[in-house]
Interface confidence: medium
């Protein structure tokens, strides 16, 4: 193992501020694989918070393995969480469009679709099941129309997807009981908002399907949902065009929709999912 | 010195409720994620919930899952466990304990409550 | 979700080594942390992040994780060593599991 031959470390009483990890992996033992080589990578340390030297064996492990220390700290450490620059024909993707693929810790083969900012393509991926981030979609269309940029360039202003269970997230039963809105948007919008595991507080919003709006809530940094969004008007775009305001049985206002999927209805209280 | 104290064990009939406190010295307790792990007569660790720091955000083991819950108040600097619907198997040694930060492992123990339940 | 084996018991002489296994599925993937416990009180951290030591442990302690085992070994092993040994991790969802401990007896 690549860290047994490693240092002792000392805890001291001193109390760190609270980590905030960038991506799941950085939450990942160092791990040097199964085979022989002796090749030089770097790893983040969760103990010490800090990017650090070990030796990979040249085939498996995981994602905390880095090339250079510049990238490690690049994935791993919240001094560069603004990497990501977006272009003005790039303004109404939602930010999570430009994260990297992440499996997260977990071990399903699971297959999702992701936007390659590289390709500017959506592209297939395992998923592990759990963790991970919000650039992972259930269908290659529900990716390409969220992420996607139509064929002049700007982004295709469509969403639509039937409402699945995603990463065994609380999702609405259907009821006979008639509700305010009817819903055509991104599947994650209805689900609660879920602070994570990891012990940060950001300042995100999620789409509370309950009243229609995008309200503020404390994420803890990793983990989850994709109903998790770092401005309200990045949470608006995405999630308050799928409702359409149901009026009467017979009538529908205040759709922009051109392409109806399954309906879903939904009726149900607010929920605070406290998960870790 | 930092130090965890709990209080509020005893004996209790099965279907009966308890509520534990950890009262936290020594240390910001508000910075710090806390867990509940228990221990019955003659057997091994099994931990029981967690929360965060905030209180935002809990988790529990499957076997009390829907009967217990964890909670804090940071103002008072005291951790909680509220155990309803008890059964004999819960029968245990309760231990209110500290995670430092992120790493998942409890650095600082309290001494334990008995929580004993039998008709 | 991850399960933790341990050995009922293990002898040792005193001041010979002792290794007590923790087995798990691909347990080389996780940080394992190690509790020292004695009669009537509660644990004591010894091990965590698969090796690090916390202050006050004594240098005999130390721990090593490879393929699907850790193993916490303590060198030089002294009476006062007896204790029952936990291993703990956690699971996908990152809960605590621990192992079903392991009774250390110092002839």
């Known amino acids: 193992d690549s860290e047994e031959d490693e240092e002792h470390t000392i805890i001291t009483d001193t109390e760190l501020p609270p980590l905030k990890l960038m991506h799941s992996f950085c939450a990942f033992k160092a791990d040097d694989g199964p085979c022989k080589a002796i090749m030089k990578r770097f790893f983040f340390n969760i103990f010490t918070r800090q990017c650090e030297e070990f030796i990979y064996g040249g085939c498996e492990g995981n994602q905390n393995r880095f090339e250079s220390l510049e990238e490690c700290k690049k994935m791993c450490t919240r001094d560069n969480a603004n990497r990501i620059i977006k272009t003005t024909l790039q303004q109404e993707k939602p930010d999570f469009c430009f994260l990297e693929e992440d499996p997260g810790i977990c071990r399903g083969y699971i297959t999702r679709y992701f936007y390659n900012n590289q390709t500017k393509q959506c592209e297939r991926f395992k998923y592990g099941g759990c963790l991970g981030n919000m650039n992972n979609f259930e269908t290659l269309e529900e990716c390409k129309n969220i992420c996607e940029d139509g064929p002049n360039g700007f982004q295709v202003d469509n969403y639509g997807t039937q409402l699945n269970a995603v990463n065994n997230s609380l999702t609405p039963q259907s009821t006979k009981v008639p509700s305010l809105f009817e819903f055509h948007g991104p599947s994650w919008c209805l689900t609660p908002a879920d602070r994570g595991l990891c012990r940060a507080n950001e300042n995100r919003f999620y789409y509370n399907s309950v009243i229609g709006k995008c309200r503020p809530f404390k994420y803890s940094g990793c983990g989850g949902n994709e109903n998790n969004f770092t401005s309200k008007q990045e949470c608006l775009r995405a999630c308050k065009k799928g409702f359409i305001q149901r009026i009467s049985k017979g009538g529908l206002i205040k759709t922009k929709r051109k392409r109806k999927k399954q309906r879903v209805k939904i009726a149900y209280e607010e929920i605070f999912v406290k998960n870790m | 010195q930092v130090q965890l104290v709990e209080s509020g064990g005893g004996l209790v009939q099965p279907g009966g409720s308890l509520r534990l406190s950890c009262a936290a010295s020594?240390?910001?307790?508000?910075?710090?994620?806390m867990n509940w792990v228990r221990q019955a007569p003659g057997k091994g660790l099994e931990w029981v919930s967690a929360i965060l720091s905030d209180g935002s955000s809990t988790s529990y083991a499957d076997s009390v899952k829907g009967r217990f819950t964890i909670s804090r108040d940071n103002s008072k600097n005291t951790l909680y466990l509220q155990m309803n619907s008890l059964r004999a198997e819960d029968t245990a040694v309760y231990y209110c304990a500290r995670y430092p930060d992120w790493g998942w492992y409890t650095d600082v123990w309290g001494q334990g409550t008995l929580v004993t339940v039998s008709s | 979700d991850i399960e933790l084996t341990q050995p009922p018991s293990v002898s040792v002489a005193p001041g010979q080594t002792a290794r007590i296994s923790c087995s798990g599925d691909?347990?080389?993937?996780?940080?394992v942390h190690w509790y020292q416990q004695k009669p009537g009180q509660a644990p004591v951290l010894v091990i965590y992040g698969t090796n690090k030591r916390p202050s006050g442990i004594p240098e005999r302690f130390s721990g090593s994780n490879s393929g699907n085992t850790a193993t916490l070994t303590i060198s030089g092993t002294q009476a006062e060593d007896e204790a029952d040994y936990y291993c703990?991790?956690?699971?996908?969802?990152?809960?605590?599991?621990f192992g079903g401990g392991t009774k250390l007896t110092v002839l």
């Open positions: 703990q991790s956690y699971d996908s969802k990152f809960n605590t599991v």
């Open positions: 691909n347990i080389r993937k996780f940080y």
């Open positions: 020594g240390f910001t307790f508000s910075s710090y994620a």
